[in-house]
Amino acid sequence: EEELQVIQPDKSISVAAGESATLHCTVTSLIPVGPIQWFRGAGPGRELIYNQKEGHFPRVTTVSDLTKRNNMDFSIRISNITPADAGTYYCVKFRKGSPDHVEFKSGAGTELSVRAKPSAPVVSGPAARATPQHTVSFTCESHGFSPRDITLKWFKNGNELSDFQTNVDPAGDSVSYSIHSTAKVVLTREDVHSQVICEVAHVTLQGDPLRGTANLSETIRVPPTLEVTQQPVRAENQVNVTCQVRKFYPQRLQLTWLENGNVSRTETASTLTENKDGTYNWMSWLLVNVSAHRDDVKLTCQVEHDGQPAVSKSHDLKVS
């Protein structure tokens, strides 16, 4: 006659986090008398998951009614699976005996892998703004996924980037993993409306990748170009001088007029016009009373943009 066999038909199963895992186990005989126990892992450090004889296992239910006469199905269902539940589960038959149970036979084991979705990617840019032609770094992080295989791509306005480095941690086996990637992006003057996108694809996402975005408007600073022009005379003694401040971003801008090096007026940009590329234009004008000046006047338009060192443009006003 054949001795009892413990049959675990599934070599491995994969379950999504939050779902239930069913671990199958049948025995071929009701003898010897004694309980079935389920363990995660093998050896002295194995973890007891379920004991037919005694104990309270709130997450575990048996698939069959173990009080039924002739029951040989000792499959269990573990609810609310998390990545921490991953491992190899063994169905073990014990033989009733004093002083303690004697392990009689073990199943071959079922490896449970847990599919856990990555967290939404978080993209962060540099702490300080940078100007066009400069290269800036963006980082993308996503956590808590399993299995380890994952694909990360970077895009700028729909165009895939190639200059990036990605790490998945830890390198060895773990219940869940994290990904960290750094991409280098060269800024252009047209990038105010641009977006950098980090896209993460994983088996748990069923072909619908997760995306994290960063707006380059948070990163870029486009310095203004200045033009000072003298307008036709308005009245006999007055000349209108304008300072055109063009193509700047962000809005924060302060303008100071200087007459022969002396501060004439300081104003903060208010009514701005926005360009299609997201930059701004602003114009300031100064009425100069020519009769108050005996000599030629040097008019300077000085602009401090976004806390940066001032830039200026001068215009010489001839007094005839």
Epitope: E1, L30, I31, V33, G34, T67, R69, M72, R95, K96
Partner: antibody, heavy 115, light 111 residues
Framework: RQLVESGGGLVQPGGSLRLSCTAS????????ISWVRQAPGKGLEYIGT?????ITYFASWAKGRFTGSKTSSTAYMELSSLRSEDTAVYFC????????????WGQGTLVTVSS | DIVMTQSPSSLSASVGDRVTITCQAS????????LAWYQQKPGQAPKLLIY???TLATGVPSRFSGSGSGTDFTLTISSLQPEDFATYYC???????????FGQGTKVEIK
Amino acid sequence: RQLVESGGGLVQPGGSLRLSCTASGFSLSSHGISWVRQAPGKGLEYIGTIGTGVITYFASWAKGRFTGSKTSSTAYMELSSLRSEDTAVYFCARGSAWNDPFDPWGQGTLVTVSS
Amino acid sequence: DIVMTQSPSSLSASVGDRVTITCQASQSVYGNNDLAWYQQKPGQAPKLLIYLASTLATGVPSRFSGSGSGTDFTLTISSLQPEDFATYYCLGGGDDEADNTFGQGTKVEIK
């Protein structure tokens, strides 16, 4: 589904006997067969359980004198060094106790030990 | 070895009565539930009524019920029927696989 015992009878003190328990309608291969006896006018007494190979065990008082074996259809129990106090009806039942209780039972076979 | 003590050893009751038989183990039975109840009528083999302390065997009328855990167990017949007059035995299992002991029996007779 039934069990039928046979092999009982009159035996002299010190003698031996082989009891059989034959299953009809089901297989014994995945079950133990337990033996229970009942002396005239007395209660039930567990003797032992016959499983596969090494999985055969007897109550402490029966060890040594009683042995057993089993095929897929018949279980056997050998009684040796019989004494007058072994006179009883011997029942076999399918099961090993706990979650595999004794059910069904055979009708019993009477063993009389007397000179 | 585990010792099972049944009480009473006999009782007289009428049809329709509620009957309770108790069984006490000298130590906790295996798994706190290795306790079965059997019914035996004269000249017949015993018949399984209850196992695992409270699980009703197939085909047994629902007037029979079992309860208890550890060392103290009860068989209850909620409304005694004429066919229930018999002797009832508990069978308790200890921690060793060969340690199975019957109680001495309770004879239920007609009053």
